[in-house]
Interface confidence: medium
Amino acid sequence: DGPAGSWEQLIQERRSHEVNPAAHLTGANSSLTGSGGPLLWETQLGLAFLRGLSYHDGALVVTKAGYYYIYSKVQLGGVGCPLGLASTITHGLYKRTPRYPEELELLVSQQSPCGRATSSSRVWWDSSFLGGVVHLEAGEEVVVRVLDERLVRLRDGTRSYFGAFMV
């Protein structure tokens, strides 16, 4: 029992020293590109960090396969409604995998935050939060998209963010 017990203790200690992959990315002035691509994120300043995950052009890149809790919140707001706004705004987390040519929907929400019928002077606020556990392989990527991104408010790194951690 003694040697087996000490072996288990050693394994536990080793596990506790292994760093679970985690990242929290925050909204920045450069997040909204207007190009139709995914949102871009701050990875280093303020509350943002990357640990055991990498980042590339808006995407969190998985380096270690496993189950991950992924999440994103976007703060929406405006004065009246932007011209050309679709009837709904889609906020989604999407997976890119080398095994498939198109992005795959992971978590998606739809909002109708500002009705065109209201007065154009109406200041409004809304938000969308997504979070869930998904399995990701090494090399796969997760991105955030918002259509219409013009409604995303970024003022500081606390309102709109994107992250993941291995569970």
Epitope: G34, G77, G78, V79, G80, P82, L83, G84, L85, A86, S120, S121, V123, R150, R153, R155
Partner: antibody
Framework: QVQLVQSGAEVKKPGASVKVSCKAS????????VHWVRQAPGQGLEWMGA????????SYNQKFKGRATLTADKSTSTAYMELSSLRSEDTAVYYC??????????????WGQGTLVTVSS | DIVLTQSPDSLAVSLGERATINCKAS??????????MNWYQQKPGQPPKLLIY???NLESGIPDRFSGSGSGTDFTLTISSLQAEDVAVYYC?????????FGQGTKVEIK
């Protein structure tokens, strides 16, 4: 470079209609609003409305609603402003202008050269 | 509608001197830390030209002698050292709500 080229000067009789065109180049036409602003001789600037070429959505100054029609043709990257039931006080230079991508903070960063519309009997 | 009142209506300034134009809105044009006020320059026979957007941001290609400041209802356009080519009419414009409105204009001349 971004360019907005408007159609030529028009002389119209009271009660008639006029249609001014604004051909855009140098940017993605469907991603930016096109606004129309007029300026009577020796006077200030007056916003008439805007069109979003991506889906044809429009917003009008109530003063012109029912008399002005704003449209956009994606195939030719051209925006149009039609004003009906013309009266002498509609004599003005009519400008098209590109609005910024963010509508709520819509500043006009590129302007057409202007089209003089004269309404006279 | 939001009414913008500029002062003065006209301004004569010596070359190299500072010119200051004020614009007062009938209600606040602030939202989420931004002020939706813009400034344009118009020379005779030409369309207006964007100088400053969202109160204090200098449009690319505009000389840095132009600056904008203010928030809420009170805004200022400053030309730090007037040049001959700055002779024009200057307009403020709010984009907080439609109908977007302009001030009546301020004519800047050389003294």
């Amino acid at each position: 470079q971004v360019q907005l080229v408007q159609s030529g000067a028009e002389v119209k009789k009271p009660g008639a209609s006029v249609k001014v065109s604004c051909k855009a180049s140098g940017y993605t036409f469907t991603s930016y609003n096109v606004h129309w602003v007029r300026q009577a001789p020796g006077q200030g600037l007056e916003w008439m409305g805007a069109v979003y070429p991506g889906n044809g959505d429009t917003s009008y100054n109530q003063k012109f609603k029912g008399r002005a029609t704003l449209t956009a043709d994606k195939s030719t990257s051209t925006a149009y402003m039609e004003l009906s039931s013309l009266r002498s006080e509609d004599t003005a230079v009519y400008y098209c202008a590109r609005g910024s991508y963010y509508y709520t903070s819509s500043y006009f960063d590129h302007w057409g050269q202007g089209t003089l519309v004269t309404v006279s009997s | 509608d939001i009414v913008l009142t500029q002062s003065p209506d006209s301004l004569a300034v010596s070359l190299g001197e500072r010119a200051t134009i004020n614009c007062k809105a009938s209600q606040s044009v602030d939202f989420d830390g931004d002020s939706y006020m813009n400034w344009y320059q118009q020379k005779p026979g030409q369309p207006p030209k964007l100088l400053i957007y969202t109160a204090s941001n200098l449009e690319s290609g505009i000389p840095d002698r132009f600056s904008g400041s203010g928030s809420g209802t009170d805004f200022t356009l400053t030309i730090s050292s007037l040049q001959a080519e700055d002779v024009a009419v200057y307009y403020c414009q709010q984009s907080y709500e439609d109908p977007f409105t302009f001030g009546q204009g301020t004519k800047v001349e050389i003294k």
